[in-house]
């Protein structure tokens, strides 16, 4: 049995330009200790979309449901979507360290942007 699962339930989300997109992610535990971060894309060139404690992400808001008893919610909402936001978004769990170590990624959610 896996100690930690990172679950992105939607494989894809389609949003009209100018609207907001909600990207869902849950983790089965806070342990091992360490942050959850959101990225667009994979590999060295991936783009950091949201980090709870570092950086400034004016279009991104955490939208977790704290009433969820059986898991921890790390979902985000991105406002004012444009075609440039299209891509695959990953919710990634890190283990706290110096530096933090990437532990597990969700399967990814592909965001497609429709014309208004």
């Amino acid at each position: 049995e896996e100690e930690l699962q990172v679950i992105q339930p939607e494989k894809s989300v389609s949003v009209a330009a100018g609207e907001s997109a909600t990207l869902n992610c849950t983790a089965t535990s806070l342990i091992p200790v360490g942050p959850i971060q959101w990225f667009r894309g994979v590999g060295p060139g991936r783009e950091l979309i949201y980090h709870q404690k570092e950086g400034h992400f004016p279009r991104v808001t955490p939208v977790s449901d704290p009433t969820k008893r059986n898991n921890m919610d790390f979902s985000i909402r991105i406002s004012n979507i444009t075609p440039a936001d299209a891509g695959t978004y990953y919710c990634v769990k890190f283990r706290k360290g110096s530096p933090d170590v990437e532990l597990k990624s969700g399967a990814g959610t592909e965001l497609s942007v429709r014309a208004k």
Epitope: E3, L4, I31, R95
Partner: antibody, heavy 118, light 111 residues
């Protein structure tokens, strides 16, 4: 019904060792993060140790790090706290507690008393 | 370490009235919209029992006269109306960052 039953407490001299056990039943033990929390009249509640559901990750406060070791046997639904180099300030009631998400303590055992005194 | 200051240390409230307990954390315990502050009730000779998780969520089986509120650093547990079986010591606990820490407790008695 969830049950957590601690055992292994007792009187020990400073510098001595004890091994506490916690027997779990009534829930899927292997899915839960497990912890020990202790309580003293003077210091109130103090977190002592935590282990991940599969046993890979353990965490301790500085007050017990290097002296206490937490382990688990999921096949036996059991949690163990090995306490070495015990000090008078380790005297407390020790509670075993479960954490489904590694956040709040969902369930607590009745506690076992550890007294460190010469 | 996140230090939690709980107040008052003791509280005497008449039956049927409101009891309010506060906890203040030395830094924010919020993350991703969750507030990692929890509340427990402990009666003499018993272990603590979870009442409220993540600031405001009532644990299953806990009477709805218990409620929690707050975010970031300031949190409140309210018991309204207070009943005789609520005589106990109440603790808050943060799990936002290690080491996890507890408030010093509030003993609630009947006036």
């Amino acid at each position: 019904e969830v049950q957590l039953v601690e055992s292994g407490g007792g009187l020990v001299k400073p510098g001595g060792s004890l091994r506490l056990s916690c027997a779990a039943s009534g829930f899927t033990f292997s899915s839960y993060v497990m912890s020990w929390v202790r309580q003293t009249p003077g210091k109130g509640l103090e977190w002592v140790a935590t282990i991940s559901s599969g046993g890979t990750y353990t965490y301790y406060p500085d007050s017990v790090k290097g002296r206490f070791t937490l382990s688990r046997d999921n096949a036996k639904n059991s949690l163990y706290l090995q306490m070495n180099s015990l000090r008078a300030e380790d005297t407390a009631v020790y509670y075993c507690a479960s954490q489904l998400t590694g956040s709040e303590f969902d369930y607590w055992g009745q506690g076992t008393t550890v007294t460190v005194s010469s | 370490d996140i230090v939690i200051t709980q107040s008052p240390a003791s509280l005497a409230v008449s039956l049927g009235e409101r009891a309010t307990i506060s906890c203040r954390a030395s830094e924010s315990v919020d993350s991703y919209g969750n507030s990692f502050m929890h509340w427990y009730q402990q009666k003499p000779g018993q272990p603590p029992k979870l009442l409220i998780y993540r600031a405001s969520n009532l644990e299953s089986g806990v009477p709805d006269r218990f409620s929690g509120s707050g975010s970031r650093t300031d949190f409140t547990l309210t018991i309204n109306p207070l009943q005789a079986e609520d005589v106990a010591t109440y603790y808050c606990h943060q799990s936002a960052d290690l080491p996890w820490t507890f408030g010093g407790g509030t003993k609630v008695e009947i006036k």
